[in-house]
Every structure is written in C-alpha cells, then in structure tokens.
C-alpha cells in the first residue's frame, strides 16, 4: 500500500473522554421533515454550541426543534447560572430525575427506565406509551448517565465538570485519559442507537458517545438513524476519528487518510449538552 492509502487517524488506545448528553436530541441534526411549509424554528448546533434558526417543513423531523430561541437555550445550552453546585458538594441533577416513575394514562407495556430517588438507582418500569413524564429513558445507560451518582457521591458528569472539594472550583471530570480531545465527527455519531420500526434483526454497529466506543446493536431493517454501520471498522472510521488528540502547544498536525492528505487544526474545547 502506498502512503496515500494508509489510515492514520489519531486515536489513543485508552478510553476516550465521554460526551455527556443530557438530552441526546440536542445532538440531532436539524431536520426540516418531508413537508413543504416554511416555519421558522430553532435547533441546537453541537458544533457551534449555539441555538440557531432553521426552516421547518411542518411535519415529522425530530425533537431538536424549538418554537423559540429561549426554549432551545433552556433545553440544550448551559449558562453560568445552571452550573451552580449544591453546597453538599454534589452536582445538581436535572429536576426530572426526582419525579416518580409514571406509566402514563395509556397501556402499551413498553420497557423503559427511570431513576428511583429512594434506591438512588435506575430501574426498569412498564411505560404505557403516552404522556408520563421525563423520568423515562429508553436505555438503562442513558438513565444512569443522566441521573445516577458516580463514585465518591459525585453525580455522573452532566456538564463534564464536577466540584473540586478543595477550592470549590469547577474542574473537568476525571477520565481515563487527559481532556485533550475535541469532537470533529459527524453529528449523528452523537445520536443514540435506533433499531427502527421493522422486524428484521441485522447485526450493526453504532458509536456510543458516552463511552467513546463502537458497539453492536440489532437493526430492524428500516428506519432508524445514521448512527448505523455494517462493520465496527466503518463505525470507528466515521466516528472515532472525530476525537482528535491535541498537540501540547496547539498548532497543526498532519493526518494521513485514504486518498487524501488533510491538515487538521487542533484546539481543545469540550462539548457538553445540558438540558434543564
């Protein structure tokens, strides 16, 4: 193979710092939907970390869509006021973690997860399929990530920060590698696995942005989202290369990718999405 064909995405073997999404829909791409209306709406852009305007077609689309700039900011951005830490040295959980599990007024027997404030753990419950409340997660992992406490009584890192007990300052949550990464990958790498609506059971891989790894899942054969790869290699190539290691003094670093030499500017900035 020539040098041109080699792939040298810059990824360490150690586990990557997790991206904590208080609500994964804040990471969805703006989706105007299939209809033809022209409606001004707002979405959260994970790359600019800002709420931005887009034109919505009036039907379908996804949950990263808000009537007003204020509503978008409230759901998907963190401002300084939201980063106040409880005096107990425990970072504040979102309010909905303290809601009781609510099956809702319909009866559809859907398995979901909720945070039980008595046991301090995420537990399974049967959701009826409509209404209920926000203490309702499709996966145990998402529930734990958002509502459970991590070791030492700290909450699992919602902002990517925790309180430094010595000087009460906000510091990056410790991870297995230094916080020397920025995410440049496609936004769908941050969306949850979605098996879709059909009945097949195809082996696929999705990028789990919480643990920074590609993981297998069963795809139904239709629908779903773009975080869906036929091989682990393809998944890694598309998503894991998005985390680029920073050089100590910044500057430029050459990366070699198939058929294309590319210069990537390196700078460190965490991306964290917080929903109130």
């Amino acid at each position: 193979d020539s040098e041109e064909d080699e792939e040298h995405t810059i990824i360490t073997d150690t586990e990557l710092p997790p991206l904590k999404l208080m609500h994964s829909f804040c990471a969805f791409k703006a989706d105007d939907g299939p209809c033809k209306a022209i409606m001004k709406r707002f979405f959260f852009n994970i790359f600019t970390r800002q709420c931005e305007e887009f034109i919505y077609g009036g039907c379908e689309g996804n949950q990263n869509r808000f009537e007003s700039l204020e509503e978008c900011k409230k759901m998907c951005t963190r401002d300084n006021a939201n980063r106040i830490i409880k005096t107990t040295l425990q970072q504040e959980k979102p309010d909905f973690c303290f809601l009781e599990e609510d099956p809702g007024i319909c009866r559809g027997y859907i398995t979901r997860y909720f945070y039980n404030n008595q046991t301090k753990q995420c537990e399974r419950f049967k959701y009826g399929g409509c209404l209920g409340n926000m203490n309702n997660f499709e996966t145990l992992e998402e529930c734990k990530n958002i509502c459970e406490d991590g070791p030492n009584g700290f909450q699992v890192d919602n902002y990517g920060t925790q309180l430094n007990a010595v000087n009460n300052s906000l510091t990056p949550q410790s991870t297995k590698v230094p916080s020397l990464f920025e995410f440049h990958g496609p936004s769908w790498c941050l969306t949850p696995a979605d098996r879709g609506l059909c009945r097949a059971n195809e082996n696929r891989f999705y990028y789990n942005s919480v643990i920074g790894k590609c993981r297998p899942f069963k795809y139904s054969g239709c629908g779903g989202n773009e975080n869906n790869f036929t091989s682990k290699q393809e998944c890694l190539r598309a998503c894991k290369k998005g985390f680029i290691q920073r050089i100590s003094k910044g500057g430029l670093i050459k990366t070699k990718r198939k058929r294309k030499k590319q210069r990537v500017k390196i700078a460190y900035e965490e991306i964290f999405v917080k929903n109130m």
Partner: antibody
Framework: QVQLQQSGPGLVKPSQTLSLTCAIS??????????WSWIRQSPGRGLEWLGI?????????RYAVSVKSRITINPDTSKNQFSLQLNSVTPEDTAVYYC?????????????WGQGTLVTVSS | DIVMTQSPLSLPVTPGEPASISCRSS???????????LNWYLQKPGQSPQLLIY???NRASGVPDRFSGSGSGTDFTLKISRVEAEDVGVYYC?????????FGQGTKVEIK
C-alpha cells in the same frame, strides 16, 4: 356499558370551593385499563382539560398548570366514584364541568362522558 | 402547551354532500411507533362530547363509516363522506402527545 353520573351544586360563591362528584357504573375507578378526568367547557375557553387520575401499581394524578394550585381530584374506591375540588373560585371558573373516562387499553381517548354540570360562580 | 387550531370554525353543509374539517397542531403528534396522538369528538346540541376517531384514523365503536380521520405530523383532517342531518354539532380535535391535554376551538357543522 360504562356510565358516569355527575352530582354537585350548580352555584358557588366567589372564593369558595367548587365540589363535584362523578359516580361510575360499568367499570371500576381502580381499573388499570382506564383513567378518570375532569374537563370543563365555557364560551370563552372552549373545552379545557383540568386533570386526571389513574391507578396502576399506585395512584397517579396530573393537573393542568392553569389550575394546579387550586385543584384536587380524588378517587373514592368504596363508592366507586371520583371527585373534583377547585378552591378559591372566581367568576372565571363558571363553566359546564364534565367528568370523563379515558380508555387506556384500545382507544386512548375519552370514550365516556358524564352529563355535564353547569357551575355558576356568583355572589 | 400544544395549540390545536381548527378550520373552518363554522361549516354550513348540504345533506348528502361531503364535508371536511382541518386541525393543525403546533408540534408533531406522530410517535415513532406510528401512533398518532390525536382524537376527534362530536358534541351534538345539548349533549356531552362523544369520541368519534381515535389515534388519528380509527373509528370508535358505533361510529358510522362515513366518518374518517387522516393526516400525520401536524396536519389532520376529519372527513364526512355524505353528511346526514344527525351529524350537526361541534367537532373537536384533541391531542395527547403532552400535558396539558388540549382541544381545538371547535368547528360548528350546521345544515344549510
């Protein structure tokens, strides 16, 4: 066939408490395949949902924010009925009040309604 | 709150002719499992409302097949293929995608 029979006063003085009862026949207030709601209708506001109760592993209730601080909906399992209490009423609360059954199983809709009670708030 | 907007507010009809009522929601009422979280009710003069159509397009028991519901996303339609005199009254759409449950302002159907 489920039937809902409403009872309660038609005239309430301002600042007092509006109390209505809905007696259920043909179903149980504790049924896990239904939920029980109060809805009111006035010329100015149209149909306005006020709140709902339902029993699953335990009792749940949800209320409209517009009346949340003043409303209580309670089940009475011994009499197989549920009640509405709305505190500190004003003339704005004048409306026809309906109790309704929400079918949780198949239809996911209000499939049975009480006959309605016109409540006037006036001194 | 999800706002439900109906049109027209008044609909004069001729018996035997078709009629159509539109309901638009301020956000999508279609869940990813395909369920549409929208119902239609008819309130005949002097009566309580009655459920006509549930989950967007299913007729409630006892509802004649001249009534049909359709639509997805934010735009929904109730159609009466051939209006009969007994169909007069006020028609309401209602969403149960999120609390509070909300109704449209109603469409009054009357015979010309």
């Amino acid at each position: 066939q489920v039937q809902l029979q409403q009872s309660g006063p038609g005239l309430v003085k301002p600042s007092q408490t509006l109390s209505l009862t809905c007696a259920i026949s043909g179903d149980s207030v504790s049924s896990d395949s239904a939920a029980w709601s109060w809805i009111r209708q006035s010329p100015g506001r149209g149909l306005e949902w006020l709140g709902i109760i339902y029993k699953r592993s335990k009792w749940y209730n949800r209320y409209a924010v517009s009346v949340k601080s003043r409303i209580t909906i309670n089940p009475d399992t011994s009499k197989n009925q549920f009640s509405l209490q709305l505190n500190s009423v004003t003339p704005e609360d004048t409306a026809v009040y309906y109790c309704a059954r929400w079918d949780s199983d198949k239809m996911w809709g209000f499939d049975d309604w009480g006959q309605g009670t016109l409540v006037t708030v006036s001194s | 709150d999800i706002v439900m907007t109906q049109s027209p507010l008044s609909l004069p009809v001729t018996p035997g002719e078709p009629a159509s009522i539109s309901c638009r929601s301020s956000q999508s009422l279609v869940f990813r499992d395909g369920n549409t979280y929208l119902n239609w009710y008819l309130q005949k003069p002097g009566q309580s409302p009655q459920l006509l159509i549930y989950k967007g397009s299913n007729r409630a028991s006892g509802v004649p097949d001249r009534f049909s519901g359709s639509g997805s996303g934010t735009d929904f339609t109730l159609k009466i293929s051939r209006v009969e005199a007994e169909d007069v009254g006020v028609y309401y759409c209602q969403q149960y995608d999120s609390y509070p449950l909300t109704f449209g302002q109603g469409t009054k159907v009357e015979i010309k």
